[in-house]
């Protein structure tokens, strides 16, 4: 890893994405961004989603999938797995469909490995939390 | 109930000035993205300026560029359109809309019409 | 500029009948595309986004596809009030933010 080849990692320039437990990454991401600048353009859309609250994975898992963990041990980035997406797509759908919309085609859970090992290696984020849902209507103005 | 109301259009003369305001309610503008989009009459959708607060970020397209400024009150829930050097040519109703997933401008405000004529 | 050149700029059509609408992108874009209707007077009304996901409320005989750079709005069977003229977007995905508009169908009466 001492040659003069291009880094394979970058340092993470998505506000919303760093101290988030890893800080380099590789483009392109997961859904096809080759720049981080359109990744966090896409990225700032789910803003009413993280501030509603409903999962407090959404975050860690939105960013796993725009700004993949990326590490200079192995040439492949490292993105969600498919249990985060599939207790964030649980919890969050609900909501989406609140707003109108349907989870989104690029965050198929079915696209990302079951679970981390040896032959495919994906992040398992933060615990999930396994406590009722609170009530909550649409962002009001002045909600944070 | 989620609800855009624009204000402020009018007669202005060539080279005028105009303040277009949006208000918004049944959601925090903070957290989505505003747009101002405009039709001249007869024709078809124009974009003209986008405003995302929570980050500062602001849009506009190369015909307006140096003549419009969008901005936005989080306090009032309100996003704005400072028309200035008005010409004939943006003569037409704009409107007010927000998008967040998909980019798609799932609400629209009912529009205000702008007349620049001498 | 990504331009969206949307085709044909007017039809006319019969109540029943199958109606597709398309918008070519100049250049390769992402399915981050939306379809509006709007009727003479009134606001746009979003019917399709990304491509092909229908909004929430928005009649099933609406759909929308994508083909390479094509993007596709059909009715499937048209109703008396599907009468309207037609958008589609283009939202921003890369090299910058730029929203563009096709140019409108308008769905006439037969």
């Known amino acids: 890893f001492g040659d003069e080849e291009e880094r394979r990692c970058d340092p993470i320039r998505i506000s919303m994405c760093q101290n988030l437990g890893y800080n380099v990454t590789k483009m392109p991401n997961l859904v096809g961004h080759e720049l981080q600048t359109d990744a966090e353009l896409q990225l700032t859309t789910f803003t009413p989603l993280i501030q509603y609250g409903c999962s407090s994975q959404l975050q860690f898992f939105l960013c796993s999938v725009y700004v993949p963990m990326c590490t200079e041990k192995i040439n492949i980035p490292i993105g969600p797995c498919g249990g985060m997406c599939l207790s964030v797509k649980r919890r969050c759908e609900p909501v989406l469909k609140e707003f109108g919309f349907a989870w989104p085609e690029s965050l198929n859970c079915s696209k990302f490995p079951p679970q981390n090992d040896h032959n495919h290696m994906c992040m398992e984020g933060p615990g999930d939390e396994e406590v009722p849902l609170p009530h909550k209507t649409p962002i009001q103005p002045g909600e944070e | 109930e989620v609800q855009l109301v624009e204000s402020g259009g009018g007669l202005v003369q060539p080279g005028g000035s105009l303040r277009l305001s949006c208000a918004a309610s049944?959601?925090?503008?903070?957290?989505?993205?505003m747009h101002w989009v405009r039709q001249a009459p007869g024709k078809g959708l124009e974009w003209v300026a986008s405003i995302y607060s929570y980050y500062g970020y602001t849009y506009y397209a190369d015909s307006v560029k140096g003549r419009f400024t969008i901005s936005a009150d989080t306090s009032k829930n309100t996003a704005y359109l400072q028309m200035n050097s008005l010409r004939a040519e943006d003569t037409a109703v704009y409107y007010c809309a927000r998008s967040s997933f998909s980019w798609a401008m799932d609400y629209w405000g009912q529009g205000t019409l702008v007349t620049v004529s001498s | 500029d990504i331009q969206m050149t949307q085709s044909p700029s007017s039809l006319s059509a019969s109540v029943g009948d199958r109606v597709t609408i398309t918008c070519r992108a100049s250049q390769s874009v992402s399915s981050a595309v939306a379809w509006y209707q709007q009727k003479p007077g009134k606001a746009p009304k979003l019917l399709i986004y990304s491509a092909s996901s229908l909004y929430s409320g928005v009649p099933s005989r609406f759909s929308g596809s994508r083909s390479g750079t094509d993007f596709t709005l059909t009715i499937s069977s048209l109703q008396p009030e599907d009468f309207a003229t037609y958008y589609c977007q283009q939202h921003p995905w890369s090299g910058g933010y730029l929203i563009t508009f096709g140019q409108g169908t308008k769905v006439e009466i037969k």
């Open positions: 049944g959601f925090n503008i903070s957290y989505y993205y």
